[in-house]
């Protein structure tokens, strides 16, 4: 039960997380106009990975998309492509933990390819969450060296007459968002890697040996496992363990409304 | 056809206070900003306050600040300026405009008269 | 504040003939994101509200007759009539769109020579 807590909490967590990626690699408040110190302007700009925008005061926002491939900063194209290998990764991971899922059935899939997938959708998680949290810090850091650097500027080449405002960008939504965003795919990455060791089979496996009594039936496991005694007319023995193994009566598996084929 | 109609405008006392109304129509005025120019006889303009569309943000000249209230009914397509501590130089024509493109005043009232006079 | 300085003061010109006015302002109205120019040209006659002619320093107004031009990027502007009309003679005010507060020029009154 707890494991499959740990499995469901995971996913529902790297889902939010992943949505985050998506949402703060769209958004165009990567860095906006720093007011602070600033003479107040009827005209904000702010800036995405894909597009730069002005908004107005009276309300007009316009905004051009960076149409050139090779005339961006190097850094900004980094950051773009951590976020994409983020979104793939996480997507991929996505997909690769609903089959992975305890609670859904998919014919007679075993529970050590369970915990394999859980594992391989874990460490997806990890990895996308560590690309979001790398392309955001990569783009906070480009954004803090040139503010110190325009804010040098400003206090420098004064002496004219006609001042020039040198216009500073701070952090905007979009980066908050993806740090929170790369940190809940981290964490259910890890919840992920938690939950698969749980699923994972013992070392040694027993076949369990049914023997069939009339009036109720008792199934056995060598090596001191725990015994499961079923009475009434039902003949059909209890899993008690299933480690790969399964007794004859077993193999079917009976449809549940949990179940996805 | 858009329309801008001021009203409110009179005589009034140094220290009186005075509210002006602009009456907006034929454009969508919740998602418009407003603003209050006005301009003293035989004078140049005087950009006096903005309001923002969503009544967000409020901007002031300094020679009106913390006299003087811009504030807006979207309810009721008007715009309001409310004039406290008035003074001699406050004596304008004063007239409602809207923000359009490039913060630009696109549409003017025809402006209400305010005499401040003892 | 931002300063803007209008010039001339006053403009005498004969009908048909070409008009300049110029407008400086003390920090630069070009906003980067965009590359545009936030500064506005109105037109004012006797007894009128002011009317809108130019804005982001060379966009006309829809309705505006096109012997009106507007020009100039950062701090320095000019406003060109190009063949003036008898309805042109006016004051003509420059006003800065970038920063608040919305400064305006003084103003530059065309008059008939």
């Known amino acids: 039960m707890a494991v499959t807590a740990c499995q469901g909490l995971g996913f529902v967590v790297s889902l939010i997380g992943i949505a985050g990626i998506i949402a703060a690699t769209c958004m165009d408040q990567w860095s906006t106009q720093d007011l602070y110190n600033n003479p107040v302007t009827a005209v904000f700009n702010y800036q995405g990975l894909w597009r730069s925008c002005v908004r107005e005061s009276s309300g007009f926002t316009e905004c051009r998309g960076y149409f050139t491939l090779l005339g961006l900063p190097a850094m900004l194209q980094a950051v773009r492509a951590l976020m994409i290998v983020g979104i793939v990764l996480g997507a991929i991971g996505l997909l690769v933990s609903i089959f992975a899922l305890k609670c859904i059935r998919i014919g007679s899939m075993e529970d050590s390819a369970k915990a394999n997938m859980t594992l391989t959708s874990g460490i997806m998680f990890i990895v996308s969450g560590l690309c979001a949290i790398a392309g955001v810090s990569v783009f906070a850091n480009m954004l803090v060296t040139n503010f110190w650097m325009s804010t040098a500027n400003m206090y420098t080449g004064m002496g004219g007459m006609v001042q020039t405002v040198q216009t500073r960008y701070t952090f905007g939504a979009a980066l908050f968002v993806g740090w929170v965003a790369g940190g809940l795919t981290l964490i259910g990455g890890v919840m992920m890697c938690i939950a698969c060791r749980g699923l994972a089979p013992e070392e040694t496996n027993y076949k369990a040996v049914s023997y069939h009594a009339s009036g109720h039936s008792v199934a056995y496991k060598p090596g001191g496992f725990k015994a499961s005694t079923g009475f009434g007319s039902n003949t059909k023995n209890k899993k008690i363990y299933d480690g790969g193994a399964r007794t004859e009566d077993e193999v079917q598996s009976y449809p549940s409304k949990h179940d996805y084929v | 056809e858009v329309q801008l109609v001021e009203s409110g405008g009179g005589l009034v006392k140094p220290g009186g206070s005075l509210r002006l109304s602009c009456a907006a129509s034929g454009f969508s005025f919740s998602n418009s900003a407003m603003s209050w120019v006005r301009q003293a006889p035989g004078k140049g303009l005087e950009w006096v306050s903005t309001?923002?569309?969503?009544?967000?943000?409020?901007y002031y000249a300094d020679s009106v600040k913390g006299r003087f209230t811009i504030s807006r009914d979207n309810a009721k397509n008007s715009l309001y300026l409310q004039m406290n501590s008035l003074r001699a130089e406050d004596t304008a024509v004063y007239y409602c405009?809207?923000?359009?493109?490039?913060?630009?005043?696109?549409?003017w009232g025809q402006g209400t008269l305010v005499t401040v006079s003892s | 504040d931002i300063v803007m300085t209008q010039s001339p003061d006053s403009l005498a010109v004969s009908l048909g003939e070409r008009a300049t006015i110029n407008c400086k302002s003390s920090?630069?109205?070009?906003?980067?994101?965009?590359?545009?120019?936030?500064l506005t040209w109105y037109q004012q006659k006797p007894g009128q509200p002011p009317k809108l002619l130019i804005y982001?320093?060379?966009t006309r107004e829809s309705g505006v007759p096109d012997r009106f031009s507007g020009s100039g990027s950062g701090t320095d502007f000019t406003l060109t009539i190009s063949s003036l009309q008898a309805e042109d003679f006016a004051v003509y005010y420059c006003q800065n769109d970038y920063y608040y507060p919305l400064t305006f020029g003084g103003g530059t009154k065309v008059e008939i020579k």
């Open positions: 982001w320093s060379s």
């Open positions: 920090q630069s109205l070009l906003q980067s994101g965009n590359n545009k120019n936030y």
């Open positions: 405009a809207r923000q359009g493109y490039g913060n630009a005043l696109d549409y």
């Open positions: 309001i923002s569309s969503g009544d967000s943000y409020t």
